[in-house]
Every structure is written in C-alpha cells, then in structure tokens.
C-alpha cells in the first residue's frame, strides 16, 4: 500500500498547526516540564511498513482523542483546533485504507500488540499528567510541545519508509 503524497503533506500541516496553537512560552512553564517516556523504540526503522501502519494509526488516533476532549476545547483556539482535527482525520483515513487493502492483516494484530500498548500507555501518562496539573495553561503547553516532538518522530518514520521503496 502506497500512502498518498498528500499524507506526508498532511503530516507537515499537522505539525504546523500544532506550532501555531502555542499560546504561551514554554520557557514560562519550565517548572512543569515532564518526561512522558515516549516509546521511541516502538517506532524504530527495523519494522516493515505493514507492521508500522497500525502503530502509526494508534498514535494519530490517540492524539485525536487527546485534543477532542472538552478540556482541550477550552485550552486552544477553536479554528485551529478544527483544522487540526481535519488533518488528523484525513491521516487516519489514509492509514485505514492501507489496512483495508490487506497489508499485514494476518500477522499485525498480535505482532504489534506490544507497540500499540506502549503507545496507549504513553497517552495514559499524558492524560494523567494533565489531570494532576488540573489542565492548567502550562500543562497544556508542555503537552503540546511533547506531541509535536513525538508526532515529528513518528512522521520521520513514515518518511523513511517511503524513501526505502
């Protein structure tokens, strides 16, 4: 399955939107910095494309879930947030189309269980952090920066997969 060129453009647009969503300086939130333990090894280049697609899908789905909450709606600009949802939704569709085409359907669910679990637990930590910080502006800024970093890392994986072909 070839992810359309528009998919990587969408990834770049998603990162741009995340950058534009910034409301306060991260430097004013240094005391709120947190290591969320992004499971980078689960996005390593050793996987075949068929194996990475469900993990990338999970990553984007979890980002969508995180920013779809009412607490998130209160924290960010509504117009930017709507554009952000649209980009994520399109990327989910692209990845789902690949799965439907039968890429790795037989082995994927079991093979990638651990990677998908690692991603879900990463977002559990982010969700709990926000709750502990009472969804403060600084907490959301820390999370926005973290999602930019982790999304960028997973996007780099997509690009490396494209270039390998």
């Amino acid at each position: 399955c070839d992810l359309p060129q528009t998919h990587s453009l969408g990834s770049r647009r998603t990162l741009m939107l995340l950058a534009q969503m910034r409301r306060i300086s991260l430097f004013s939130c240094l005391k709120d910095r947190h290591d969320f333990g992004f499971p980078q090894e689960e996005f390593g280049n050793q996987f075949q494309k068929a194996e990475t697609i469900p993990v990338l899908h999970e990553m984007i789905q979890q980002i969508f879930n995180l920013f779809s909450t009412k607490d998130s709606s209160a924290a960010w600009d509504e117009t930017l947030l709507d554009k952000f949802y649209t980009e994520l939704y399109q990327q989910l569709n692209d990845l789902e189309a690949c799965v439907i085409q039968g890429v790795g359907v037989t082995e994927t669910p079991l093979m990638k269980e651990d990677s998908i679990l690692a991603v879900r637990k990463y977002f559990q930590r982010i969700t709990l952090y926000l709750k502990e910080k009472k969804y403060s502006p600084c907490a959301w800024e820390v999370v926005r920066a973290e999602i930019m970093r982790s999304f960028s890392l997973s996007t780099n994986l997509q690009e490396s997969l494209r270039s390998k072909e």
């Epitope: 269980e113 651990d114 930590r125 709990l128 502990e132």
Partner: antibody
Framework: QVQLIQSGPEVKRPGASVKVSCKAS????????INWVRQAPGQGLTWLGW????????GFPQKFKGRVILTSDTSLNTAYMEVSRLTSEDTAVYFC????????????????WGQGTTVIVSS | DIQVTQSPSSLSASIGDRVTITCRAS??????INWYQHKPGKAPKLLIY???VLQNEVPSRFSGSGSGTDFTLTITSLQPDDFGTYYC??????????FGQGTKVEIK
C-alpha cells in the same frame, strides 16, 4: 480467582541453569503480562523481567539481560523463567506475578502471585 | 532507570499506633506507585495501587497518598496481623518496574 502455581524447589551447581514454571489456573494471558520477582535471603524484592505470553515479547532490567530467558506455552497456560550461569548470589525464592496489560484505572500492581519457588545454588 | 528509595528501613510500633512509610522516586512518576505487604514464607500482597486506591478486601486502616516523587503509606491503627515487610513499587513505564528496598514493621 485465578491462581498461579509454580514448580517445586531446585538445587543447582554454580554455572548450571534452572527453569521454573508458572501455571495459571485459568486463561489470564490475553489480558495480563507475567512478571518474575525474586527475594534472596535477607534481601528485598528484585524485579527480574516481564513477558507478554501472547506475543513472546520480554523486557528486563539491565542487570539480568542475557542471563534470564522468559517464555510461555499458551496452550498450557504456563510461563517459564530460565536463569543461566548460576552463582550463589542467585540463591533466592522466585515468584511469578501477573499485571494488567492495560488498565483504565492505572492499576499496574501485581494482583496475583505464585507461591514462590526456592532455588538453591551450592557446590 | 527509575529508582525508588524507601524509608525507614525498619520500625517498631505498638498495637494501635499510626505508622507512616515513605517512598521517593528518582523522577516524577505521577501516581504510578503501588504498595505491598510481604510476610515470611508467603507471596507479597498488593495493598494499594495508583498511589491511593485500596485493592479489594484490604482493610481501610491502610491508605496511600502522594504524587510526583513523594509517596506515603499509612496504617492508621496498627494491628497484630500487620507485621511484615512493606514495599513500594513504581510502574511509570509499565511493564517495566522497580521496587523500593523495603520497610520491616515489627510489633513492640
């Protein structure tokens, strides 16, 4: 309530290997990881590693990488821990314990434990 | 790796006393901490998970608190059955974990 039943005590020579089994009384492998923990005489609890019985994936603290092997036979509902190159410092009671793979309540505690297997390493 | 440091290493208290055991993590682990009671010749028993949630059938005299790096296990009124060694365990990057060194509780 599910039970984890471990194999019996072992006496081994230094340099040898030991394999301990941990059988679940009912299927718990789809929803739980199996962990191994040991307690040496007069010491505290030490975590040895985790196993996802359905995928075979494992994880270990640095100290035990390469010397502890964790495997399972899902058809037998049994997990195994093998420790190689045994020394007297490996004399301990070894426990298996389960933990949820994913918990909405953040419950990542070891809620069910085996009864323990005593391993003595002596020349 | 994340380390957890427990204190005190041992304590002696009378029946009815309030007992407090502390655990400090080497980094912010939110509330990913569990507490166990371990008696000689038995398997450890999970008392509290997620820093403050009492496991099923654990007496209400046990309670846990804390968040970030500092955590506390409290026994409000020590009972004869409460002797043993208590351990904290961090599960921030579950399924990886680590245990504290333990606190031995003796009855005076």
């Amino acid at each position: 309530q599910v039970q984890l039943i471990q194999s019996g005590p072992e006496v081994k020579r230094p340099g040898a290997s030991v394999k301990v089994s941990c059988k679940a009384s009912e299927n718990t492998f789809d929803t739980h990881y199996i962990n191994w923990v040991r307690q040496a005489p007069g010491q505290g609890l030490t975590w040895l590693g985790w196993l996802n019985p359905t995928t075979g994936k494992t994880g270990f603290p640095q100290k035990f990488k390469g010397r502890v092997i964790l495997t399972s036979d899902t058809s037998l509902n049994t997990a195994y821990m093998e420790v190689s190159r045994l020394t007297s410092e490996d004399t301990a009671v070894y426990f298996c314990a389960r933990v949820l793979k994913l918990s909405d309540e953040y419950n990542y505690g070891f809620d069910v434990w085996g009864q323990g297997t005593t391993v003595i390493v002596s020349s | 790796d994340i380390q957890v440091t427990q204190s005190p290493s041992s304590l002696s208290a009378s029946i009815g006393d309030r007992v407090t055991i502390t655990c400090r993590a080497s980094q912010n682990i939110l509330t990913f901490i569990n507490w166990y009671q371990h008696k000689p010749g038995k398997a450890p028993k999970l008392l509290i998970y997620a820093a403050s949630v009492l496991q099923n059938e654990v007496p209400s005299r046990f309670s846990g608190s804390g968040s970030g790096t500092d955590f506390t296990l409290t026994i409000t009124s020590l009972q004869p059955d409460d002797f043993g060694t208590y351990y904290c365990q961090q599960t921030y990057l579950t399924p990886q974990c680590s245990f504290g060194q333990g606190t031995k509780v003796e009855i005076k």
